[in-house]
Amino acid sequence: IWELKKDVYVVELDWYPDAPGEMVVLTCDTPEEDGITWTLDQSSEVLGSGKTLTIQVKEFGDAGQYTCHKGGEVLSHSLLLLHKKEDGIWSTDILKDQKEPKNKTFLRCEAKNYSGRFTCWWLTTISTDLTFSVKSSRGSSDPQGVTCGAATLSAERVRGDNKEYEYSVECQEDSACPAAEESLPIEVMVDAVHKLKYENYTSSFFIRDIIKPDPPKNLQLKPLKNSRQVEVSWEYPDTWSTPHSYFSLTFCVQVQGKSKREKKDRVFTDKTSATVICRKNASISVRAQDRYYSSSWSEWASVPCS
Amino acid sequence: RNLPVATPDPGMFPCLHHSQNLLRAVSNMLQKARQTLEFYPCTSEEIDHEDITKDKTSTVEACLPLELTKNESCLNSRETSFITNGSCLASRKTSFMMALCLSSIYEDLKMYQVEFKTMNAKLLMDPKRQIFLDQNMLAVIDELMQALNFNSETVPQKSSLEEPDFYKTKIKLCILLHAFRIRAVTIDRVMSYLNAS
């Protein structure tokens, strides 16, 4: 058993039918010695008397808010949450496995640049009685500071019969140098509590591996005289690290017909312009990627050919 | 401690091409190592990230773009003095700071070259003959070093008398390749910046 925060305790349980459970001793936070009784949640049934209460915790019915009283007056509370260990593996019932880029990916994180700022998000089908708290650091043995905001509900979507809720959090490394070569990963830790169930999720990454630039901006077409060709031009996104000659991007230019089945023409360039053939009803899209370290491509920026 | 913006004329920068080749070569070699050593801990998540140049060179700091010198987090106080007769920039405008930067890159390459050659000698003794260093990568390191053209003492190739532990050697190869790829990215960024300046 360990303390999550004041008066909230987590009991770690080997979780299988008929498991023996854990013996827990609760102590009433009071100078009083006698006349103390204990109750659980809203029930008035007295579970025991005395300054300490010993309970065998085996299932969720044994968790909840234990209160010690004296003569009708509340002395203190202890909220017991359960952390299930199924076959030696901590349970992951609260968050959905996003399965990208691999199974057991519960947290996903992205950074728009090398400033040390990043966003993480996760999914759940649970809509109520749910709280999250997020901590982060650079490295774990001698951790360096990363400050995270509060997790907020960022999207809701319907998936089949279920509603899916997306939560996200923004974090900023306290002293980040965009040019630094990372040798210690960023660690992100999310505590999740649903009713009386506690779970924790972690992700470990280097900023360089989660880079996803914003799409190129000011995408423009300039028709070339007496030709079906156009000059496409664009600019680096505002959010990308500077100087651009040091933090260079490479680009992919795509001409896509109206029908998804039509052949796509693609050109790769390090410049911020390209000459392509504009077909009727087609659109031109451009996306960006770090030129030297192949992390994710940005989303496409698009303009119609017409 | 940083790169001045006023640097040589465009097209006077032969190192950019070599640095791009270097990054391509090390990335290919790392990919090959990951595939060949699939049952070894060779992914970025599995390895310890070690930098063999730590406390010996200060490439990131010495090659910091001018725009980042205002960022206090970038200004570590590691100073190293280097020989300053680099010819990569073929220009008298080459400042002391730039020479320090290029000299630091040269020292990095020399250190990795020695490590890779020592490691290759061990891998050649492996009866499994599972993996060897790509000769192209070693050649590209050499070409960039020649383009940088610094005079420095040659570091003797390490030789060890004890029987090599091939498992450990292959894990060390993965660690080295990961670190060298990161350094190659920095070198490429620096060369691109200098070329544009």
Partner: antibody, heavy 112, light 107 residues
Framework: EVKLVESGGGLVQPGGSRKLSCAAS????????MVWVRQAPGKGLEWVAS????????YYADTVKGRFTISRDDPNNTLFLQMRSLRSEDTAMYYC?????WGQGTTLTVSS | DIVMTQSQKFMSTSVGDRVSVTCKAS??????VAWYQQKPGQSPKGLIY???HRYSGVPDRFAGSGSGTDFTLTISNVQSEDLAEYFC?????????FGGGTKLELK
């Protein structure tokens, strides 16, 4: 006493469908992840699918992905395995399990 | 996929003996390994989880050990009711995979 009782097996033609059920008792079913495992005649054990408590996470073996669907009905303490596009190689004894307990199994035969 | 190899398909033993059933994973699975017992004509039953933890009610003559890629189920003081097939299983990553089984027979 913990009990898992499978039902729904039988003879099915190739390409056909079948839904297996597993009735659980003796434990708080909704609080536990569950799995389906199968065993072809005279062969070893093969994991088929898993479902977490609350159905938030579901995983399938590649051999059944897209054809089988695992689901649960917590109020009725029942686990299901909906099987479609059945093949002869799906012939096996199907067990539902929540370690260390396994049901007695239900036999599915896919044959024309 | 992780392959779990039980190299011995059959093992002969006598009542009162100590026997060790081995299992090898094709890659590191930490301690995320379980052992099952299946008696002829019956369904399997879980014995060990996390490589070395016994489920409650499992006799203490059953002991699991190992981590990484090499795992062992040891039955000390074999009883006649222990004559069965034993399967190892990894649950470190999906798909979950079982060993091919080792049948324990009387000499």
């Amino acid at each position: 006493e913990v009990k898992l009782v499978e039902s729904g097996g039988g003879l099915v033609q190739p390409g056909g469908s079948r839904k297996l059920s597993c009735a659980a008792s003796g434990f708080t079913f909704s609080d536990y992840g569950m799995v389906w495992v199968r065993q072809a005649p005279g062969k070893g054990l093969e994991w088929v699918a898993s479902i977490s408590s609350g159905s938030s996470n579901i995983y399938y073996a590649d051999t059944v992905k897209g054809r089988f669907t695992i689901s649960r009905d917590d109020p009725n303490n029942t686990l299901f395995l909906q099987m479609r596009s059945l093949r002869s190689e799906d012939t096996a004894m199907y067990y539902c399990a929540r370690n260390p307990y396994w049901g007695q199994g239900t036999t599915l035969t896919v044959s024309s | 996929d992780i392959v779990m190899t039980q190299s011995q398909k059959f093992m002969s033993t006598s009542v009162g003996d100590r026997v060790s059933v081995t299992c090898k994973a094709s890659q590191n699975v930490g301690t995320n390994v379980a052992w099952y017992q299946q008696k002829p004509g019956q369904s399997p039953k879980g014995l060990i989880y996390s490589a070395s933890h016994r489920y409650s009610g499992v006799p203490d003559r059953f002991a699991g050990s190992g981590s990484g890629t090499d795992f062992t189920l040891t039955i000390s003081n074999v009883q006649s009711e222990d004559l069965a097939e034993y399967f190892c299983q990894q649950y470190n990553s999906y798909p979950l995979t079982f060993g091919g089984g080792t049948k324990l027979e009387l000499k």
